[in-house]
Structure formats: C-alpha cells, structure tokens
Amino acid sequence: GSVKVLHEPSCFSDYISTSVCQWKMDHPTNCSAELRLSYQLDFMGSENHTCVPENREDSVCVCSMPIDDAVEADVYQLDLWAGQQLLWSGSFQPSKHVKPRTPGNLTVHPNISHTWLLMWTNPYPTENHLHSELTYMVNVSNDNDPEDFKVYNVTYMGPTLRLAASTLKSGASYSARVRAWAQTYNSTWSDWSPSTTWLNYYEPWEQHL
C-alpha cells in the first residue's frame, strides 16, 4: 500500500551540534528500512545530506541530524522520502525551534546554616550563544509523598540553588531534577536531567526544646 505521513515532522535544535526531527506514519513502519530524511542548508554551495531515521514507537520515526554550530540565519530544506516517493517537504530554522541540551551532573551538598546546595552544569560551552541565555527549573519531590513537591525557577546566571532544609520534611528522602530553557530564543524546555536523591536529615528546632 501507499506510505503516508500522519503527523508531519516536528523539529528542534540544541543550537550547537544536533537537530532532531520526529514524525508519525499512518501505520507501523520500519523507519530505517523504508524512509530517508534529506536536509540541505539554504546556503550557496551546500550539499544535500541524508539522515536515516530510527523507530521511537511502531509508527513514530525520529532522525538526529548533525549540524554546524547554528546561527540565526540558517534555514534547512527538509524532504522526507520513501524510496523515490516524496512524502513531505518543508523548511526548518534551528534558531526558531530551540530545545536546549539537558543540564548535567546534578549534585546535592550540605551547606552552611542548614541549607542544601544543589549544583549542576550548564550544558553549553562558554562560547556558545546559549551559554548565557539559560534559565532553569528545579523540581524537588518527596520520594514517599507525591503531594510534597516544590518547583524553583532559577533565573540568575549560576547553575546553583540553595535550599533551606527546614522547607523539607525531616527524615524524608527527596529527589531533585533540573531542566533548562532559553527565553530570548523562545525555546521549549529541555528534557529533565536524571534525578539525584538525598536524605533530608535536618532536625526541626522544636525537637531541641
């Protein structure tokens, strides 16, 4: 039968080295065997490149395309092929569809004055446009009480958050995770970082009385 696209490709760029496109076919498809996504920068002399998609689900395909360090003017022509059949054609401007890289190395350290210091790494090198543009969201949740969670917006430059131990339940196990976004690029949120877990051993003041 004929091959059809149910949901056309949706693409995001990490604005440093990779753009990822995802789309859904109208029936289960072996993406890597049946489909190819060609991409070409709209720039004089540029070559046509081919991405071999992989299956994310039975009918969902995803393609990761290596790109050069992106700049605002970059526009790519995308063509989705099933053999000689052109299924979809469109354009993609990475700077208009940014999904930041995931923050890394989230750690929790005890700090002075009964505070926890949460630290993570900015996923971009200092020379990249996004390095100084990221703001973060930190989610802290009680592992044993789904109702006990807090969300912190970190809008200052440093990838750190100081957390008063007294704001958390004593003796409880907590997990934290962090994600990033770039306001000036009107980006989507990054994926969440892996969680890090710690025991909040702060002793409330009343117990000293």
Partner: antibody, heavy 125, light 112 residues
C-alpha cells in the same frame, strides 16, 4: 602544491559551441566547490558559474543561463564548462578557481583561494 | 542581485604611504556575526587574480600583514600600508554570499 590548468579555449563563430576543462591537483577536489570567472579584454572580472563539491548543485550568471553548463568529474579531478550558442560578448579569458569547502554542513568559505592561468575564448565571425 | 560598487576607480600612491579602497554592496553581506562574505582580490598586470582577503578581514595564506580588510554589512575597506612598487595592479572586491556572485568594477592602483 595546488594547481589548476585550464584548456579548451579557441576561436569560434557566433552560435558555435566550446567545452573548457580545468584539471586540478594538490587538494581534495571533491570537497570543494569550483567556480568559473571570465574577463573580457580590457575589462573587469565577471563571475560565470559555480558547482558544489558533489556536483549536485549549480549556479549561473544571468548572462549565461540556459547556454552554459558547468559540470565536474571528481574521479578525474576535472571541472568543465560547456558553452553553447556563443556570442561575441562571451569573448574573454576564462579562469577556473577553487571556491568554498562544501563537505561540511555549512560550507566553509575562504574566498576564491586559488586561480588557474586562464584560457582565451574568442567568438568572432 | 547584489550590486558591488568600488571607489575610487583609480588611485596613485607614493611608496611607503597607505592606500585605501572602499567597496559598498547593495545588500548586507553579513550572514552571521563575524561572517561577512566579502573578498578582496589583486590582479597584477598580465597575471591571474590572487586572493588577498576573505570574509571581510581574514588574510589569505601568504598575504603580508600590510594588507588589511575591515567593515561589515554593506560597507568595506581594503587598506594597504607601506605601499610597495610590487602592489601595483587592479584590486577587486567580490561578494560570496549568494548567487549570482559579483565583483566590483575594480580599482587601479598606480605607484608614483
């Protein structure tokens, strides 16, 4: 050492055809776009055409579009310019030049960083 | 099409002096910050052209630092300091951003 050697220039009548060749050596030919530039006697430089490294994309000046065809044989390290329906105003020295590196996603630009010695095309009855 | 305009069309300079040539484009040649697709070429009498400057300000291999390029957007300048007799020839600017590529009319530099 990078070398570009053009050949094929000749005296030809208006309406006639000619094929210029440019043999390259000293660099990885298939990785670079190549360009033809011409210079009419006593005049300035005029860009003619460009072809990317794979040969998959070509560009032309309006003055030659539909009459000239740029091509390349990467196995032979050779660039070509097929010129048809020649006119008196096509009389010029034709230079081939190495252009941008196109094997990267965004071509890396170094200008026209090496030129051949040129070949003279004369169109006259 | 992008039109390239050079001034002056001819220039006479004494050895040791500085020569300046201006090039203006009808559209911006800036693709992104630091990437101005404007080149300068020199054609000495009886020779093929040779590259001097690319991307507005980067010197081609083997070009002495007496040659410098500056500018962005639509306005660019080539400066030749401590001019020598060997610098005589015609200087061309060229835009390499989009098809059709285009050269300026050329500036003839004469050494007094």
């Amino acid at each position: 050492e990078v070398q570009l050697v053009e050949s094929g220039g000749d005296l030809v009548k208006p309406g006639g055809s000619l094929r210029l060749s440019c043999v390259a050596s000293g660099f990885t030919f298939r990785d670079y776009a190549m360009t033809w530039v011409r210079q009419a006697p006593g005049k300035g430089l005029q860009w003619v055409s460009l072809i990317n490294g794979s040969g998959g994309k070509t560009y032309y000046a309006d003055a030659v579009k539909g009459r000239f065809t740029i091509s390349r044989d990467n196995a032979k390290n050779t660039l070509y310019l097929q010129m048809n329906s020649l006119r008196a105003e096509d009389t010029a020295v034709y230079y081939c030049a190495v252009d941008r590196l196109t094997k990267t996603i965004r071509p890396q630009y170094y200008g026209l960083w090496h030129w051949g010695q040129g070949t003279l095309v004369t169109v006259s009855s | 099409d992008i039109v390239m305009t050079q001034t002056p069309l001819s220039l006479s300079v004494s050895p040791g002096e500085t020569a300046s040539i201006s090039c203006r484009s009808s559209q911006s040649l800036t693709y992104s910050i630091g990437y101005n697709y404007l080149d300068w070429y020199l054609q000495k009498p009886g020779q093929s052209p040779q590259g001097l400057i690319y991307l507005g300000s980067k010197r081609a291999s083997g070009v002495p630092d007496r040659f410098s390029g500056s500018g962005s957007g639509t306005d660019f300048t080539l400066r030749i300091s401590r001019v020598e007799a060997n610098d005589t020839g015609v200087y061309y600017c060229m835009q390499g951003l989009q098809s059709p590529l285009g050269f300026g009319q050329g500036t003839k530099l004469e050494i007094k």
